[in-house]
């Protein structure tokens, strides 16, 4: 949950790609104004997930979840939260 | 803001060698089945995507990272 909060559109696109849902991917890419060649490129990545099956998608989803919830990322998120709090306090 | 470790993972997925990418994945999930899957996906992407396709995918990532939704 925390990881998706940091950059929701990234996880939207990633899970649309890994899920193999072309319509979902198109919707996500529309949110960032992706061009036609950019969509074509992302669909090629999606093809790889589709071709390699459900297990492959689950395993790669697991990798992304593990990285996103690792100390490398969580430490970063905590640091950002502290910075935000400092700025908000100073702002008052 | 996206976590630098995630950004590095995605960059290597597109522009790194299969060995570089698998090495990066191994830092977080060293299970043989996970690493084999990472190599298969990386090889697939390298086989399908031209250099221009990869640049276009990186361009999408730039748009994502600079989006108000990130």
């Amino acid at each position: 949950v925390k990881m998706a909060e940091t950059c929701p559109i990234f996880y939207d696109v990633f899970f649309a790609v890994a899920n193999g849902n072309e319509l979902l991917l198109d919707l996500s890419l529309t949110k960032v104004n992706a061009t036609e060649p950019e969509r074509t490129a992302m669909k090629k990545i999606q093809d790889c997930y589709v071709e390699n099956g459900l297990i492959s998608r689950v395993l790669d989803g697991l990798v992304m979840t593990t990285i996103s919830s690792s100390k490398d990322c969580m430490g970063e998120a905590v640091q950002n939260t502290v910075e935000d709090l400092k700025l908000n306090t100073l702002g008052r | 803001e996206i976590c630098p470790a995630v950004k590095r993972d995605v960059d290597l997925f597109l522009t790194g060698t299969p060995d570089e990418y698998v090495e990066q994945v191994a830092q977080y999930k060293a299970l043989p089945v996970v690493l084999e899957n990472a190599r298969i996906l990386k090889n697939c992407v390298d086989a399908k995507m031209t250099e221009e396709d990869k640049e276009n995918a990186l361009s999408v990532l730039d748009k994502i990272y600079t989006s108000p939704l990130c």
């Epitope: 060649p37 071709e51 | 697939c44 399908k48 250099e51 221009e52």
Partner: antibody, heavy 121, light 113 residues
């Protein structure tokens, strides 16, 4: 040794469809480390790449913007050939047409003999 | 698209002389991820298709004589024939393959003086 043999009419009427075929020997049209291209050459345009088809678990095509709306490149795995269809031709499409193999999608290492196609008005 | 510009348009040299053909791309064809220049050179004789001579800017295709060599990086490239022979009379083309749309130079005609 890879060989590419082109066939198709040398004369096409304006507004009609130009159709050429490239028969492959010594390689497979569905090889996953090559791409199959069409290029044309005319005095006014020089060498002009038109498009390609390639197989990487599924078929992909790339086309030149200048012809994108009226070109089709189709592989035929049963005959081990690929074809070019260029619709709504005009006299500007008069050229020598070549098929060629690209290593991956890079340099063009094998070429067909070329077919002069004249578009008559 | 990347525009490829060749110079000179034509070249007349004596047998045994050194011939140099230049090719300039409108954008760099050096791909930073692998440090390769996505550039090839072709030779075309009358009534024949182009023949691949050089790829990756400097790698000679098998069967190409070693008097023919390629060099350069980024946007500026050179094809050199160190000692011109009668069989080298042809039109030479450079081509980039970094982009999905392949593009060729306008050609350089090499003749014997």
């Amino acid at each position: 040794q890879v060989q590419l043999q082109q066939s198709g009419p040398g004369l096409v009427k304006s507004s009609q469809t130009l159709s050429l075929t490239c028969a492959i020997s010594g390689d497979s049209v569905s090889s996953n480390s090559v791409a199959w291209n069409w290029i044309r050459q005319s005095p006014s345009r020089g060498l002009e790449w038109l498009g390609r088809t390639y197989y990487r678990s599924k078929w992909y095509n790339d086309y030149a913007v200048s012809v994108k709306s009226r070109i089709n490149i189709n592989p035929d795995t049963s005959k081990n050939h690929f074809s070019l269809q260029l619709n709504s031709v005009t006299p500007e499409d008069t050229a020598v047409y070549f098929c060629a193999r690209a290593w991956n999608w890079y340099y063009l290492d094998y070429w067909g003999q070329g077919t002069l196609v004249t578009v008559s008005s | 698209d990347i525009v490829m510009t060749q110079s000179p348009d034509s070249l007349a040299m004596s047998l045994g002389e050194r011939a140099t053909i230049n090719c300039k791309s409108s954008q760099s064809v050096l791909y930073s991820s692998n440090n390769k220049n996505y550039l090839g050179w072709y030779q075309q004789k009358p009534g024949q298709p182009p023949k691949l001579l050089i790829y990756w800017a400097s790698t000679r295709e098998s069967g190409v004589p070693d008097r023919i060599s390629g060099s350069g990086s980024g946007t500026d490239f050179t094809l050199t024939i160190s000692s011109l022979q009668a069989e080298d009379v042809a039109v030479y083309y450079c081509q980039q393959y970094l982009r999905n749309t392949l593009t060729f130079g306008g050609g350089t005609k090499v003749e014997i003086k």
